[in-house]
Amino acid sequence: EEELQVIQPEKSVSVAAGESATLNCTATSLIPVGPIQWFRGVGPGRELIYHQKEGHFPRVTPVSDPTKRNNMDFSIRISNITPADAGTYYCVKFRKGSPDVELKSGAGTELSVRAK
């Protein structure tokens, strides 16, 4: 049995330009200790979309549901979507360290942007 699962329930999300997109992610535990970060794309060129403690992400808001008893919610909402936001978004768990070590990624959610 896996000690930690990172679950992105939607494989894809379609949003009209100008609207907001909600990207869902839950983790089964806070342990191992370490942050959850959101990225667009994979590999060394991936783009950091949201980090709770570092950086400035004016269009991104955490929208977790704290009433969820059986898991921890790390969902985000991205406002004012444009076609440039299209891509696959990954919720990634890190283990705290110096530096933090990537531990597990969700399966990814593909965001597509429809014309207004």
Epitope: P32, V63, N70, M72
Partner: antibody
Framework: EVQLVESGGGLVKPGGSLRLSCAAS????????MSWVRQTPGKGLEWVAT????????YYPDSVKGRFTLSRDNAKNSLYLQMNSLRAEDTAVYYC???????????WGQGTTVTVSS | DIVLTQSPASLAVSLGERATISCRAS??????????MHWYQQKPGQPPKLLIY???NLESGVPDRFSGSGSRTDFTLTINPLQAEDVATYYC?????????FGGGTKVEIK
Amino acid sequence: EVQLVESGGGLVKPGGSLRLSCAASGFTFSSYVMSWVRQTPGKGLEWVATISSGGTYTYYPDSVKGRFTLSRDNAKNSLYLQMNSLRAEDTAVYYCASQLTGSEFDYWGQGTTVTVSS
Amino acid sequence: DIVLTQSPASLAVSLGERATISCRASESVDSYGNSFMHWYQQKPGQPPKLLIYRASNLESGVPDRFSGSGSRTDFTLTINPLQAEDVATYYCHQSADLPWTFGGGTKVEIK
């Protein structure tokens, strides 16, 4: 019904060792993060140790790091706290506690008393 | 370490009235919209019991006269109306960052 039953407490001299056990039942033990929390009249509640559901990751506060070792046997639904180099300030009631998400302590055992005295 | 300061240390409230307990954290315990602050009740000779998780969520089986509120550094546990069986010591606890810490407790008595 969830049950956590601690055992292994007792009187030990400073520098001595004790091994506490916690027997779990009534829930899927292997899915839960497990911890020990102790309570003293002077210092109140103090977190002592935590282990991940599969046993890979363990965490301790500085006050016990290097002296206490937490382990688990999921096949036996059991949690163990090996306490070495015990000090007078380790005297407390030790509670076993479960954490489904590694956050809040969902369930607590009744506690076992550890007294460190010469 | 995140220090949790509970106030008052003791509280005497008449039956049927409101009891309010405060817990202040030395730094924010919020992350991703969650407040990692929890409340426990402990009666003499018993272990602590979870009442409220993540600031405001009532644990299953806990009477709804208990409620929690707050975010970032300031949190409140409210018991309204206070009943005789609520006489106990109440503790706040943060799980936002290691080492996890507890408040010093608030003893609630009947006036």
